[in-house]
């Protein structure tokens, strides 16, 4: 927890971030929190990055005032407004990029005092894996596929019934680029698999960890996918 | 290549309401924001309002507030404008237009157009 | 809401001259953080749709001729055409996104 120090004579207000991870592409939130104040009139909330010379978002007198945001921000980002006054500054971030990576500041300024933390934001690509089995092989064989990774991950597999187990051998994981350029396609094939065995395909990198199971017996095929977040810390 | 298609001319009776279409291609319609752009015969270019596809999330101006209502069809890549209680002043050509991408906003100048659409509001 | 005014409404000049036409905004459109003014220019040639020339007031956008050259900040702009070509036959407005977007009455320039 960092608590930010009131300056000119103002008492300091506790201001919470967590770190945590967009999706390039998609929208990404970017959560701050702080002791309300009653009156939503005296409440400022400006979210900076560093390296970048605009504001992020500036929300004062109860709206938006964009008039100083950066460019690459433009059209972008939202707070939430109806929740302002319950002490939510989080920032809602349309169209998540690369380039938004980075350190961002919520700085909060109400009638009790001003306070700032710092929020460590990573940006990639992650999905779930789906885990089938590949009736066009000539062995029993399993296909993992994620449409969306950046960083490339690694893909390691596991089974039930043989854990410890080195896979490597008999897999093939091929990384194919996405039209986009950025993001990659993720497709690992498992060879020689056995009836009546649970298989997991684990993707990872950095950002996130995901994994996708698949418990195939004669009679049936059962499947499962979760995905973690690898960096949600608290400041 | 970035296309914006719209549909075809409009002849409408006054009170009445249309429903104008811009169809994209060429690029992820859902994070980019659409614009629309109203042009009188002879006259010069007015910014209506625009919409983002990925939320359905919307801008107006003061003045066609209530009177065009945007929304987005994300699975067809196509942006819609209904003008309501149609008067004569509202005879025009309407334009999509789409922002160029700077480091993933697309609030910013229209490096691209649709032909426009005529609409003629006439007893 | 934020005003743009353009002047002279209309002009006409020989090829190969140069011109300018001025924007004038109701109030600042400078981010003073960034530095940049949020004007831009746009040509509409007869029947056509418009095509931007010039965004953040001075830089050109790819493709658009080193003939057209924007500057200004703040409040007043101006686009220049270093020298007319006939197919510069257009009108041309100017745009304001410091607050959501507003365009200019434009300045329709004809070619003697």
């Known amino acids: 927890l960092i608590i930010g120090f009131g300056i000119s004579g103002r008492h300091s207000i506790t201001v919470t971030t967590v770190a945590s991870a967009g999706n390039i592409g998609e929208d990404g939130i970017l959560s701050c929190t702080f002791e309300p104040d009653i009156k939503l009139s005296d409440i400022v909330i400006q979210w900076l990055k560093e390296g970048v010379l605009g504001l992020v978002h500036e929300f004062k007198e109860g709206k938006d005032e964009l008039s100083e945001q950066d460019e690459m921000f433009r059209g972008r980002t939202a707070v939430f407004a109806d929740q302002v006054i319950v002490g939510n500054a989080s920032l809602r971030l349309k169209n998540v990029q690369l380039t938004d990576a980075g350190t961002y500041k919520c700085y909060i300024i109400t009638s009790k005092g001003k306070g700032n933390a710092n929020l460590e934001y990573k940006t990639g690509a992650f999905s779930m894996p789906e885990v089938n089995v590949d009736y066009n092989a000539s062995s029993e064989t399993l296909r993992c596929e994620a449409p969306r990774w950046f960083p490339q991950p690694t893909v390691v597999w596991a089974s039930q019934v043989d854990q410890g187990a080195n896979f490597s051998e008999v897999s093939n994981t091929s990384f194919e680029l996405n039209s986009e350029n950025v993001t990659m396609k993720v497709v690992s094939v498992l060879y020689n698999v056995t009836i009546n065995n649970t298989y997991s395909c684990m993707i990872e990198n950095d950002i996130a960890k995901a994994t996708g199971d698949i418990k195939v017996t004669e009679s049936e095929i059962k499947r499962r996918s979760h995905l973690q977040l690898l960096n949600s810390k608290a400041s | 290549q970035v296309q914006l298609q719209q549909s075809g001319a409009e002849l409408a009776r006054p009170g009445a309401s249309v429903k104008l279409s811009c169809k994209a291609s060429?690029?992820?319609?859902?994070?980019?924001?659409m614009q629309w752009v109203k042009q009188r015969p002879g006259q010069g270019l007015e910014w209506i309002g625009a919409?983002?596809?990925?939320?359905?999330?919307?801008r107006y101006t003061q003045k066609f507030k209530g009177k065009a209502t945007l929304t987005a069809d994300k699975s067809s890549s196509t942006a819609y404008m209904q003008l309501s209680s149609l008067a004569s002043e509202d005879s025009a050509v309407y334009y999509c237009?789409?922002?160029?991408?700077?480091?993933?906003?697309?609030?910013?100048?229209?490096?691209?157009w649709g032909q426009g659409t005529l609409v003629t509001v006439s007893a | 809401d934020i005003v743009m005014s353009q002047s002279p409404s209309s002009l006409a000049v020989s090829a190969g001259e140069k011109v300018t036409m001025s924007c004038k905004s109701s109030?600042?459109?400078?981010?003073?953080?960034?530095?940049?003014?949020?004007l831009a220019w746009y040509q509409q040639k007869p029947g056509q749709s418009p095509k931007v020339l010039i965004y953040?007031?001075?830089s050109r956008e790819s493709g658009v001729p080193d003939r057209f050259t924007g500057s200004g900040s703040g409040t007043d702009f101006t686009l220049t055409i270093s020298s007319v070509q006939p197919e510069d036959l257009a009108v041309y407005y100017c745009?304001?996104?410091?607050?959501?977007?507003?365009f200019g009455g434009g300045t329709k320039l004809e070619i003697k």
């Open positions: 109030q600042s459109l400078l981010n003073s953080r960034t530095r940049k003014s949020y």
């Open positions: 919409i983002y596809p990925g939320d359905g999330d919307t």
């Open positions: 745009k304001q996104s410091y607050n959501l977007y507003t």
């Open positions: 060429g690029y992820t319609f859902t994070t980019y924001w």
């Open positions: 953040w007031a001075s």
């Open positions: 237009a789409r922002g160029r991408d700077y480091s993933g906003s697309s609030w910013t100048w229209f490096a691209y």
